[in-house]
């Protein structure tokens, strides 16, 4: 079954294809895409009650 | 921040055709998912689909057949069609756009459909 | 479609006290070390509004008294202290699997 747009890696997930640096993984269309195209969530306000978590938009190493 | 604003008709009848506009400002449709999701009386919420960054459609198969999601880069608008309505379509609809995880964290504040003869 | 199953239907609580929801999925909504399971609140008259992303994940602007637990099928929302704010629909929602889904929800009010 496809799976929807959780596009990217998280922190503690390794990516499922290699992608370029600047490219990004999108699980839904399930190919490296320019990782401006998809969306991070916002970003924690300093002293934010849980650790914020890399963006999940990472190139890959 | 992303704005989003649900337009279109508020009453259809039955076996017409729905069409909804979402207006975006903040951001460009040409990156992120563009979602549509609807909410019946008695509280459950249905996801419909979406529209991404590249054009690619999802469709939620329960309304495959009557469903189109469309959209118009130039106006940083895009759409929602449903065919054949009839009154179990009678809901308030909602544009949303999930970041990279599929959480959907900003939302129109929905346009209420009612079908009826 | 992966079902999720939220209880209590209906909660009231004291105002300072604990209020604990669940949302049980029909199958491991886990992939790739993320469990893609959220929370959002809705009161009457407005969208729905992310409170929890990945579980455990605080939006941002969302207080600390939110709270997010779980993986796999299991899940849990915590609100403490709850306030009178809080009064609510609390739904969860799956983003593992197409379709993707919501719970029935879970009305929260003050006792």
């Known amino acids: 079954m496809r799976r929807g747009p959780r596009s990217l890696r998280g922190r503690d997930a390794p990516a499922p294809t290699p992608c370029v640096p600047a490219e990004c993984f999108d699980l839904l269309v399930r190919h490296c895409v320019a990782c401006g195209l998809l969306r991070t969530p916002a970003p924690k306000p300093a002293g934010a009650s849980s650790p914020a978590p890399r963006t999940a938009l990472q190139p890959q190493e | 921040e992303v704005q989003l604003q649900e337009s279109g008709p508020s009453l259809v009848k039955p076996s017409q055709t729905l069409s909804l506009t979402c207006s975006v400002t903040g951001d460009s449709i040409t990156r992120g998912y563009w979602n549509w999701i609807r909410k019946f009386p008695g509280n459950k919420l249905e996801f419909m689909g979406y529209?991404?960054?590249?054009?690619?459609?999802y469709y939620n198969p329960s309304l495959k057949s009557r469903i189109s999601i469309t959209r118009d880069t130039s106006k940083n608008q895009y759409y929602l069609q449903l065919n054949s309505v009839t009154t179990e379509d009678t809901a308030t609809y909602y544009c949303a756009t999930p970041h990279t995880y599929g959480a959907m964290d900003y939302w129109g504040q929905g346009t209420t459909l009612t079908v009826s003869a | 479609d992966i079902v999720l199953t939220q209880s209590p239907v209906s909660l009231a609580v004291s105002l300072g006290q604990r209020a604990t929801i669940s949302c049980r999925a029909s199958?491991?909504?886990?992939?790739?070390?993320?469990?893609?399971m959220h929370w959002y609140q809705q009161k009457p008259g407005q969208p729905p509004k992310l409170l929890i992303y990945?579980?455990?994940d605080l939006e941002s602007g969302i207080p600390a008294r939110f709270s997010g637990s779980g993986s796999g099928t299991d899940f849990t929302l915590t609100i403490n202290p709850v306030e009178t704010d809080d009064v609510a629909i609390y739904y969860c929602q799956q983003t593992s699997k197409d379709p993707w889904t919501f719970g029935g929800g879970t009305k929260l009010e003050i006792k």
């Open positions: 529209i991404n960054y590249s054009g690619t459609t």
């Open positions: 199958e491991s909504v886990d992939d790739y070390g993320i469990s893609f």
């Open positions: 990945r579980a455990s």
